[in-house]
Each structure stands twice: as C-alpha cells, then as structure tokens.
C-alpha cells in the first residue's frame, strides 16, 4: 500500500545534489486564478504557516478537512483545518481524524468489526442527517482496502477516485458516491466559485480528462454570470 511504501526503509530515489537551499518559499504559487490567500495576521501562526485555501476536503492534507475558519463565517473563504480528534464534535466524516468517523455529531473510532456496516448504513442515510455522507472517506485510507478488492466500474459505490477503474472518478450521487466517467472534450463541467456550493451538489460531476480544463464556453462569454456554461476544453 501507499503507506507501507512510504514508511519502509527502502532508499528513495534521491535527486542529484541541489545547488542551494532546499526550499523556495519565495516562489509565488497560485492556488487558482483570482484566488487570494487569507492575508495579514488573521491566519498566520508563529512558524509562518499559511493555511491552504480549498474548495473540497480532497484538496487538503490527510489530517485536515476543508471548511470556513469561523463558525458560521464567510462561506467564501474556506481553508484546510486540522481534523477533529475522538469525542470532538463533527458534522461530517471528513472532519474526523483518520481512524475515526462522524456519528451523531461526534467523532468516534472506526472499530474494524462494525465499520463496514456503518458505511452501508451511511450510504442509505437521509440527507438531513449527514450532508456529506462519504466525503471523509475519500481521503481516509485506513480501512478502504478491505472493502474494495477490484476497481469499481461505472455506477459502483466508491469512497475515492482510486477505488474506480481507469477513466472513472468517485463523485457524489444523491447521498452516496459512485464511479462516474471522467469528462471528455465538449462535455459540461462544474467550475466551483469556491463559495462552498460544492457541498450541496447531489449530482457531482467528474473533473475534465487529461489535457482538458473546465472553461467558459466561447459563445457564452456574453451571458449573465448565472447562466454561463462551462465545458471541458483543450488547454
């Protein structure tokens, strides 16, 4: 597995010697066009850690989830926040640290013996109970290998895109997540405006395939903001 390779004592493929400093903090890096990082001292910490702006949990580290930093705050600013430990309050699975999941608003341990039953129960849960159902598992690798022995075909229930066969991604469908086709050139795609609206999509689309990006359709440039159609287009 990924973790066993990373944690093994195998000598990694090291680069040729670098000609200077290891990091380049001075390099300007953009998260996405037109997105500004939260500035000032508001999110700065003593070690100059700058939070990472995000639109979904999958973009964050394995021990993080994506949310607004202030409770009930500006939905337009979402950053990667540290996951919540056992017995802490939660609203969805992704908020809980690896090895835990969200049950009745509290992070609880993913006991291996009943975990699969919980997953199946979660898939059939009503929308009002847990808005994101399987979101958290898209990035929790702890137990997923026990559940998926073969790559899922189109329509198979999944936890993350790596559970799906080539050419498919794991996307929300009603209140579970299933393998759907990666979008081809000309197909309609979803361009998130990073306002948190992705969390409400119950029919989530896959991303655009290799060499394609989600852009406004040429003849829709003049249309009003709300009716702009995005399609997968060549870079």
């Amino acid at each position: 597995t990924l973790n066993s390779v990373l944690n093994s004592n195998a000598i990694k493929n090291l680069p040729p010697p670098l000609g200077g400093a290891a990091g380049h903090p001075g390099s300007a890096v953009s998260a996405a066009p037109g997105i500004l990082y939260p500035g000032g001292n508001k999110y700065q910490t003593i070690d100059n850690y700058q939070p990472y702006p995000c639109a979904e949990d999958e973009e964050c580290g394995t021990d993080e989830y994506c949310a607004s930093p202030t409770r009930g705050g500006d939905a337009g600013v979402q950053i990667c926040l540290a996951c919540r430990k056992r017995r802490k309050r939660c609203m969805r699975h992704a908020m809980c640290c690896p090895g835990n999941y969200c049950k009745n608003g509290i992070c609880v341990s993913s006991d291996q013996n009943h975990f699969r039953g919980e997953i199946e129960e979660t898939i059939t849960e009503s929308f009002g109970n847990d808005h994101s159902t399987l979101d958290g598992y898209s990035r929790r690798t702890t137990l997923s290998s026990k559940m998926y022995h073969t790559k899922g075909q189109e329509g198979s229930v999944c936890l993350r895109s790596s559970d799906c066969a080539s050419g498919l991604c794991c996307a929300r469908h009603f209140w579970s997540k299933i393998c759907k086709p990666v979008l081809k050139e000309g197909q309609v795609c979803t361009k998130h405006r990073r306002k948190g609206s992705h969390g409400l999509e119950i029919f989530q689309r896959c991303y655009c395939g290799e060499g394609l990006s989600c852009r406004i359709q040429k003849d829709h440039h003049q249309a009003s903001n709300s009716s702009r159609l995005h399609t997968c287009q060549r870079h």
Partner: nanobody, 129 residues
C-alpha cells in the same frame, strides 16, 4: 524500483513551444503531488509548476504563469508540462518530482523542494534567442 523519467527536452527558438513528459513506474502516484522544477547552470533549483493529488489544483511560479500548463493522467502515470512562449531564461535542466500528500498542507507545500520524495534525472531544455 520507483522511477521518474523525463522526456521531451531539446533545443528550441525563443517564442517556440515544447511539451515535457514525465512517466512514473514502480508504484502509483495518485496520492502524490507531481511537480516540475528546473535548474540553470550555477543557479539554485527552482519551482516551476505542480499539480495536486486531487487533480483539480495546479500551482505555478510567477515567472511561468500564463505560459506553462501542467496536467496529469493517473491511469497512465504521466505528467505533462506544456511550455509556450519560451524565453532564453527558461534554459535549464527540468526535473519531474513527486511529493506525498502531507498530513497538513500549507501554501508553500508545492514549491518546497524538500517535500518531494522522488525525482527524475532531468531533461535539458535550451532556448536560443
């Protein structure tokens, strides 16, 4: 054995385009960020572009923004760097690298050389004026 192999380098004229390719073998890299760095003679290795594990996020250094585009195909374990409007100052050895998804991520994660565990041997790009 894990290997990253770059290809596509060469000698081009200023203003031309070039596409570099990086093929990974020995493991799957779908939970890794893939990046391109470059090193000109007598200079430090510098960040060029990166694409995250989630495929939806790309990152570019200011000096290549709008000219270079990074993409990846997890099924084929390949990463592409499409370079256009090349300048003489883009001349360097270009390295492909892979950084594991961290527990915590910060703005500078993708541009920090030391976060990358696996590196290719590099491909030379020379842009003549």
């Amino acid at each position: 054995e894990v290997q990253l192999v770059e290809s596509g380098g060469g000698l081009v004229q200023a203003g031309d385009s070039l596409t570099l390719s990086c093929t990974a073998s020995g493991r799957t890299f779908d939970n890794y960020a893939m990046g391109w760095f470059r090193q000109a003679p007598g200079k430090e290795r510098e960040f060029v572009a990166a694409i995250s594990w989630s495929l939806s996020r790309t990152h570019y250094a200011d000096y290549v923004k709008g000219r270079f585009a990074i993409s990846r195909d997890n099924a084929k374990n390949t990463v592409l760097l499409q370079m256009s409007s090349l300048k003489p100052e883009d001349t360097a050895v270009y390295y492909c690298a892979a950084a594991p998804r961290p527990k915590r991520i910060s703005v500078s994660y993708f541009s920090t050389t030391s976060n990358y565990d696996y590196w290719g041997q590099g491909t030379q790009v020379t842009v003549s004026s």
